[in-house]
């Protein structure tokens, strides 16, 4: 931004500048250019010997300027365009200035003035241009500063040229008031801080409802000596509840919200929220809907799921496979998990209690993501009730629970009681027994054995009797042996795993029971 202190051309001849000597030399004249009247100060004493004609401006108030720019538009005639070359003719003039705190009026003293420069034209007006009225306009600019007094004068010294001053413009530069990145920067006088620091650092202030982001830098810009803003640093962001609209922050409209200072716009209130008021930072959940602590405010409010669908319990001897389907209502969430709990009841006494400690699950029964689980190590002659609860991220925010139950009675055999009957270096004779009342239900017995420490291979023998001899074994080797009854319903309870050792080739070893 240029702040003009003096503009001769704009004054249309109304500036009465001082000429010295009075009535000679410089003269105010009017001409027609492009069908418009134009005023100029002119002098053309090219055949009268040495000249010393001065033209002084009126006193110019400095305002805030520290350095001023002087722009001159002028024309100079070619000395060769005059008859005989006009021997005393010159083609330059001198520019001077003087600072003062007061206007001296018509009191003009050359010694008060300091020379700024000799002004020479880039183009002179030759005869043909003059005749054709082609004004060869020269533009020269000079900078003066630092200025310290209240005001100043400019002066033009003619030393025998044929020159016309068409424009004298004096201005200083400011970086204009500016809005950048939601920060307001004040109008700033363009001045070099020092020779090594040609930029003035200016702090901006965030516009209404804008803030410096947490941990970020406040807005800064640099004002150059040319009055231009450079190198923005930092920024302001619209605070929560407000969004950027052009260079301002506007409150979120009703039904919209913004939860943090950011560059993003206000978002529409998500599903299952109550309509927000203007400038909302969040949208409240409808009754019965909730937000988990980790849920973003942009996410719909959700609710706990309904119970799992179609829970079935399929008994397989001493095992039960539980299967269910996902809840009909997920509550609007994807993070559904299931928990299985177990209760066992003794038919004789009707007593019931938790059975988590005595049964084995195919995977941990809490936070299940799949919709099936196998429960094994069930006790015979026991009634079991399994509850499958569906939970999601907001289930913890309510006291009610969503579960479905299924019951199953275990009629399988008791586990066989196993013992080692005999052994040799290459064989083991094993016997077992079960209660007589259950023997009719047993179809066969399955004996599983393997070397201790060898998890990769095992052997299975089936028999209808109550004993088996395991042959072709390695001497002096411990084997793991388990016996399980097979019934029409499937596998019965398995015995515990026993460790039996074959004899060494030396022949003496203790029997392991």
């Amino acid at each position: 931004k240029e702040v003009v202190l003096l503009d001769f051309a704009a004054m249309k001849g109304e500036l009465g500048w001082l000429t010295h000597p009075y009535g000679k030399g410089w003269d105010l004249m009017q001409n027609i250019m492009d069908d418009m009247p134009i005023y100029m100060y002119s002098v053309c004493n090219v055949v009268s010997g040495d000249q010393d004609n001065w033209l002084r401006t009126n006193w110019v108030y400095r305002e805030e300027a520290e350095r001023i720019f002087i722009e001159l538009k002028f024309t100079v005639r070619d000395c060769n365009s005059f008859p005989g070359g006009a021997s005393s003719c010159k083609e330059t003039f001198n520019l001077y200035y003087a600072e003062s705190d007061v206007d001296y009026g018509t009191n003009f003293q050359k010694r008060q003035f300091t020379k700024i420069d000799t002004i020479a034209p880039d183009e002179i007006t030759v005869s043909s241009d003059f005749e054709a009225r082609n004004v060869k306009l020269n533009v020269e600019e000079r900078m003066v500063g630092p200025l310290t007094r209240k005001g100043f004068y400019l002066a033009f010294q003619d030393i025998g040229a044929c020159v016309a001053l068409l424009s004298v413009r004096v201005y200083y530069k400011k970086c204009p008031e500016m809005l950048q990145s939601l920060a307001r920067f004040p109008e700033t006088i363009a001045v070099a801080v020092s020779d090594t620091q040609p930029l003035a650092t200016v702090a901006g202030t965030c516009v209404d409802h804008a803030v410096v982001p947490y941990g970020g830098e406040g807005p800064l810009m640099h004002c150059t000596v040319d009055g231009e803003w450079l190198v923005p640093i930092g920024q302001c962001l619209c605070q929560e509840g407000y969004e950027k609209v052009e260079d301002a922050c506007r409150a979120c409209s009703p039904g919209f919200f913004k939860s943090e200072a950011s560059e993003s716009p206000c978002l529409e209130c998500p599903e299952h929220t109550l309509p927000s008021t203007e400038g909302a930072t969040s949208c409240q959940c409808e009754e019965g809907y909730f937000r988990a602590p980790e849920d973003p405010l942009s996410m719909s409010c959700t609710r706990p799921p309904s119970a799992p669908n179609y829970l079935t319990a399929i008994g397989m001897g001493a095992k039960v496979e539980l299967r269910w389907t996902a809840p009909k209502d997920t509550g609007g969430r994807q993070d559904i998990v299931y928990s299985v709990t177990c209760e066992q009841c003794w038919p004789e006494s009707g007593e019931c209690g938790p059975c988590e400690a005595s049964v084995r699950y195919s995977e941990p029964p809490h936070a299940l993501t799949r919709t099936s689980v196998t429960v094994s190590d069930l006790e015979p002659h026991m009634n079991y009730t399994f509850a499958v609860e569906a939970r999601n991220g907001v289930s913890g925010l309510v006291t009610s629970r969503s579960f479905r139950t299924a019951s199953v009675s275990i009629n399988q055999t008791e586990p066989p009681k196993v013992r080692l009957e005999d052994r040799s270096t290459t064989s083991l004779s094993v016997t077992w027994s079960i209660p007589v009342s259950q023997q009719s239900r047993v179809w066969k017995y399955e004996v599983t054995y393997r070397k201790k420490g060898d998890a990769n291979s095992y052997n299975v023998r089936r028999t209808e009797g109550f004993s088996v001899t395991l042959d072709d074994l390695a001497p002096d080797t411990t084997y793991l042996v388990q016996v399980q009854a097979l019934t029409q319903e499937g596998q019965g309870a398995g015995s515990k795993v026993h460790e039996f050792q074959t004899l060494s080739t030396e022949g003496s070893a203790n029997m392991a029971v």
Epitope: I32, M40, P83, E131
Partner: antibody
């Protein structure tokens, strides 16, 4: 010494034509703007037409526009005025005048010109 | 066209007198004004251009002044050779109009 010598004047009937000449000497003719100025008997001066140093541009007074044509031949140092459709009110002494920008000690030329050098004039009489 | 009006039309004066002729323009012509002297049966002669600039060879008793619409020609110390008719001419526009003339005669 600058000299301008007009010729070609005389008596002519209304509607007739005449061609005036102006022979120049003592200066560089091709540097000068040239003009014709007339003066009716016992009256003041009236500018008629002008022509630039190299033959253009040309300007005419409203009273003669379309009837008179100004021209020059720089190789012959001669200025001409072709006058057609002459009227009684064209009766006057016709002066050839010149202007040299070199003698105009101003930084910017005026919108038009004045006349530094004049011939002695030639009389044109339009009468039946 | 710009009209130029001179006054007086005739001026009677004696040798040594200071005489002033005025010229008024119908609109502003800045300082684009010339003055001529014409003697009977002779061609006009340029005296002053740009309102106040003396043409080469013209005696310094002649001076011109004015700007805009009001101009004057002053002869300080009238000489016998100065009795003639004087014309002003504007050259602010292409019409280059003359005043009607002022005759300076012997009183």
């Amino acid at each position: 010494e600058v000299q301008l010598l007009e010729s070609g004047g005389g008596l002519v009937q209304p509607g007739g034509s005449l061609r005036l000449s102006c022979a120049a000497s003592g200066f560089t003719f091709s540097h000068y703007m040239m003009a014709w100025v007339r003066q009716a008997p016992g009256k003041g001066l009236e500018w008629v037409s002008r022509i630039g140093p190299s033959g253009g541009p040309t300007h005419y007074a409203d009273s003669v526009k379309g009837r008179f044509t100004i021209s020059r031949d720089n190789s012959k140092n001669t200025l001409y005025l072709q006058m057609n459709s002459l009227r009684a009110e064209d009766t006057a002494v016709y002066y050839c005048a010149g202007y040299d920008s070199g003698y105009d000690y101003v930084a910017v030329a005026g919108p038009a010109e004045y006349f530094q050098h004049w011939g002695q004039g030639t009389l044109v009489t339009v009468s039946s | 066209d710009i009209q130029m009006t001179q006054s007086p039309s005739t001026l009677s004066a004696s040798v040594g007198d200071r005489v002033t002729i005025t010229c008024r323009a119908s609109q502003s012509i800045s300082t684009w004004l010339a003055w001529y002297q014409q003697k009977p049966g002779k061609a006009p002669k340029l005296l002053i251009y740009k309102a106040s600039n003396l043409h080469t060879g013209v005696p310094s008793r002649f001076s011109g002044s004015g700007s805009g619409t009001e101009f004057s020609l002053t002869i300080s110390g009238l000489q016998p050779d100065d009795f003639a008719t004087y014309y002003c001419q504007q050259y602010n526009s292409y019409s280059r109009t003359f005043g009607q003339g002022t005759k300076v005669e012997i009183k």
